[in-house]
């Protein structure tokens, strides 16, 4: 089911236990460490001690990352997988998650996504079923990583606040982002709204409050009038290019 995928993920075993324990009751799934690396304060890893964030699936990485083995040959054969930087427009890809926000994988190339090209309720997974080298397809995590177009054609896209696994589960103008203990469909950010600017790829782990990316024509930048002693907790907002 949707939520247990996130909460029972194999990769969770790599994380430290929840601070102070306390979350899930007996009989519930598991109390996930909510903020392995926090968005503010001094909780970010520094460049000196930075280590790649281990993962088992794309959903554990940020919106600008995907989960893969750093060396191609080791993929899916017990090699360590980490969150890698997403691929920009016109770069090679094997699945949508590899492409940066606003793009999707078409014929092995990251292309700009345009929701108007997809019939309502259609999932953006049309070309990846035939890719035999998609290592996530055989992740052995007990649920189908990909759903064929035919079975999804009549599926209503997730509305704001409903649970999701990936952004293609959500309606136009929404992305799939973590909020509290689950992943839900959240609005793509508009001008002036608070956004999250990560220090570097993979620096944020399982944030408990992920945000969508800024909408078209906007970039996530430090709020100009926001002067604060602590650089790491400065607010970033979506601003015009």
């Amino acid at each position: 089911t949707l939520n247990s995928v996130l909460i029972n993920s194999n990769a969770i075993k790599n994380l430290p236990p929840p601070l102070g324990g306390a979350g899930g009751q007996p009989g519930s799934a598991v109390s996930v460490a909510p903020g392995v690396l926090y968005e503010g304060g001094n909780k970010y890893q520094t460049l000196d001690n930075y280590q790649p964030y281990p993962c088992a699936e794309d959903e554990e990485c940020g919106s600008d990352e995907y989960c893969s083995s750093p060396s191609r040959g080791a993929a899916g054969v017990g090699g360590v997988q980490i969150c890698l930087a997403c691929r920009k427009r016109r770069k090679r890809c094997m699945r949508h998650a590899m492409c940066c926000p606003g793009n999707y994988c078409k014929n092995g190339i990251c292309m700009p996504s345009d929701h108007s090209h997809f019939p309502r309720g259609e999932i953006e997974e049309s070309i990846i079923e035939n890719l035999g080298n998609d290592h996530n397809a055989a992740a052995g995590d007990g649920y189908p990583r990909r759903t064929t177009l035919t079975s999804k054609i009549y599926h209503t896209k997730g509305q704001e606040g409903s649970v999701c696994l990936r952004s293609s589960d959500c309606a136009a103008g929404l992305c799939c982002a973590r909020h509290f203990w689950s992943k839900i469909c959240k609005p793509v950010l508009k001008e002036g709204q608070v956004c999250t600017k990560h220090k570097r790829k993979g620096s944020h782990g399982l944030e408990i409050f992920q945000r969508c990316y800024c909408g078209e024509g906007l970039a996530c930048r430090i709020q100009k009038d926001h002067h604060q002693a602590s650089n790491s907790s400065r607010l970033h907002t979506c601003q015009r290019h």
């Epitope: 089911t1 909460i7 598991v30 968005e39 997730g158 606040g161």
Partner: antibody, heavy 116, light 112 residues
């Protein structure tokens, strides 16, 4: 439109039990996490518990842990709160809330009074 | 225990702007660039006004805005109107207990 209607509140003696229900309509109930939030008379809001859309995960406030149990029946679009070993300090209006992007929709609440 | 601290009351005249503060710690409000605000009229259920620091749900007036600096979040209401008179609650998340936390609430009085 989204509607949440609580029921099951009433007067109960300390140590007693009560089961609250929340009937949901106007949205795909099985796609949302749901919470209970309470408010003692003249006091502020206090989060009580949350349950995942598929019931696989539950979380509780320390003040009710071990005494209250949250559950849901997606086939009936209903959320429940089983309250055992009730204390005077549990007296409050209990709201069920849809836990989408935070508590984006609330019921009107049901009053639970614990008194001898 | 109230984890987030709000002033018990604030007041302002119609047309004025007021700001309600909400102070937490590094384990809750300060640990995340995240906070929500709710409005509650007497005898009514709370209503979500702001989420994720400064995002307004559809249908909420743009007179309501949110911000955050360090361990303190703020709700600003501009162009005060009589119907804004209500209790306002901030809400965040506490990582040590893995739970949702609310502020104690602030009663807003619109004078005149």
């Amino acid at each position: 439109q989204v509607q949440l209607v609580e029921s099951g509140g009433g007067l109960v003696q300390p140590g007693g039990s009560l089961r609250l229900s929340c009937a949901a309509s106007g949205f795909t109930f099985s796609s949302y996490w749901m919470s209970w939030v309470r408010q003692a008379p003249g006091k502020g809001l206090e989060w009580v518990s949350v349950i995942s859309s598929d019931s696989s995960s539950t979380y509780y406030a320390d003040s009710v842990k071990g005494r209250f149990t949250i559950s849901r029946d997606n086939s009936k679009n209903t959320l429940y709160l089983q309250m055992n070993s009730l204390r005077a300090e549990d007296t409050a209006v209990y709201y069920c809330a849809r836990h989408g992007i935070d508590f984006d929709h609330w019921g009107q609440g049901t009053l639970v009074t614990v008194s001898s | 225990d109230i984890a987030l601290t709000q002033p018990a009351s604030v007041s302002g005249s119609p047309g004025q702007s007021i700001t309600i503060s909400c102070t937490g710690t590094s384990s809750d409000l300060g640990g995340y660039n995240y906070v929500s605000w709710y409005q509650q009229h007497p005898g009514k259920a709370p209503k979500l006004m702001i989420y994720d620091v400064n995002n307004r749900p559809s249908g909420v007036s743009n007179r309501f805005s949110g911000s955050k600096s360090g361990n303190t979040a703020s709700l600003t209401i501009s162009g005060l109107q009589a119907e804004d008179e209500a209790d306002y609650y901030c809400q965040s998340y506490d990582s040590p207990t893995d739970s949702v936390v609310f502020g104690g609430g602030t009663k807003l009085t619109v004078l005149g």
